[in-house]
């Protein structure tokens, strides 16, 4: 018979014959021959292959490097890679999440508009007139200036975007 030029799914062509690919979780040890089947071996501990393959080496599971703010979300198997995610208080630097960075804080004069998530950073906004923030924080919104009037006091020092107003007693009119 004519040697094949193409093989079925889950097969590969070698030495003019079709050999079975190794299943996910296994690597190729030796190609099939006219008389023997393809020889495959399971991937070792901390290794994987996720497709039908003819790889002679398994891939190492991804390392979720804590120095990059990563932790294991899902442990890898012989057929799947480890999935990493960000530590609490960190967010991914891209959709692929190959590393994480600490959430940014909003500087004094700015408040948190949107608290960070595992995939997005803190969104800050400038404190508008009537509001202030005197801390660097990843959680605090701008606070409204104290209302001196409701405390029966007067403004002794005007507020800014970084400082609250300072209230003081009203001057008593002398008789």
């Amino acid at each position: 018979p004519e040697p094949p030029t193409a093989c079925r799914e889950k097969q590969y062509l070698i030495n003019s014959q079709c050999c079975s690919l190794c299943q996910p979780g296994q690597k190729l040890v030796s190609d099939c021959t006219e008389f023997t089947e393809t020889e495959c071996l399971p991937c070792g501990e901390s290794e994987f292959l996720d497709t039908w393959n003819r790889e002679t080496h398994c891939h190492q599971h991804k390392y979720c490097d804590p120095n990059l703010g990563l932790r294991v979300q899902q442990k890898g198997t012989s057929e799947t890679d480890t999935i990493c995610t960000c530590e609490e208080g960190w967010h991914c630097t891209s959709e692929a999440c190959e590393s994480c960075v600490l959430h940014r804080s909003c500087s004094p004069g700015f408040g948190v508009k949107q608290i960070a998530t595992g995939v997005s950073d803190t969104i800050c906004e400038p404190c508008p007139v009537g509001f202030f923030s005197n801390v660097s924080s990843a959680f605090e919104k701008c606070h409204p200036w104290t209302s001196c009037e409701t405390k029966d006091l007067v403004v002794q020092q005007a507020g800014t975007n970084k400082t609250d107003v300072v209230c003081g007693p009203q001057d008593r009119l002398r008789a």
Epitope: D50, T93, A96, E98
Partner: antibody, heavy 113, light 108 residues
């Protein structure tokens, strides 16, 4: 990771370099391209994430295209409209938007008429 | 456009001494900064990740610090082998992935 051979190119040519990876899957790790002109510093060109998203430096957006073939385990950089300023050693490194712990040896690209 | 500015260059010190290299970001990048060492004819080698964490297998003589926009790499007990060019790199986001201009360290 290892870059394909560079070589001599003429101005206006298109550069195509291939980075071949082994020991890891392109579905697990991204690959980036960095270049270094003779006697100069490192310059990030762009990268492709493990999810297939491509990212580019602002200067490279209009000229560079980065693609991958997960089966062939290759990542390709194509750069159009070459000038003498593109003469550099081109490196590929493992990782998209991240730290680059594994680098290829680099390949020299010379652009001259 | 986002920039990383490294100072000074070059910097020189005697064997056993200490050098400090600064890297300034044009906007806050939190702790998304790495430091690399590069010797002629070789690719860069990562030293510090996350602004202050020592990369695997790197000597504790290398120390990174800083966050936000100001970062520092210090090399203590200088050895001849530390003579190289050092680069900072931001990886905070795709729009701020960039290398600093490099600082040459000369060990006398």
């Amino acid at each position: 990771v290892k870059e394909s051979e560079g070589g001599l190119f003429k101005p206006t040519d298109t550069l195509t370099l291939t980075c071949t990876v082994s020991g890891f899957s392109l579905s697990s790790y991204g690959v980036s391209w960095v270049r270094q002109a003779p006697g100069n510093g490192l310059e990030w060109i762009g990268g492709i994430g493990s999810d297939g998203s491509a990212y580019y430096a602002s200067w490279a957006k209009s000229r560079a295209t980065i693609t991958r073939d997960t089966n062939l385990k290759t990542v390709t950089l194509e750069m159009t409209s070459l000038t003498a300023a593109d003469t550099a050693t081109y490196f590929c490194a493992r990782g998209g938007i991240t730290v680059y712990a594994i680098w290829g040896p680099g390949t020299l690209v010379t652009v001259s008429s | 456009a986002f920039e990383l500015t490294q100072t000074p260059s070059p910097v020189s010190a005697a064997v056993g001494g200490t050098v400090t290299i600064k890297c300034q970001a044009s906007q806050s990048i939190s702790n998304g900064l790495a430091w690399y060492q590069q010797k002629p004819g070789q690719p860069p080698k990562v030293l510090i990740v996350g602004a202050s964490n020592l990369a695997s297998g790197v000597s504790s003589r290398f120390k990174g610090s800083g966050s936000g926009t100001e970062f520092t790499l210090s090399i203590s007990d200088l050895e001849c082998a530390d003579g190289a060019t050092y680069y900072c790199q931001s990886y905070f986001s795709s729009s701020s992935t960039v290398f600093g201009g490099g600082t040459e360290v000369v060990v006398k």
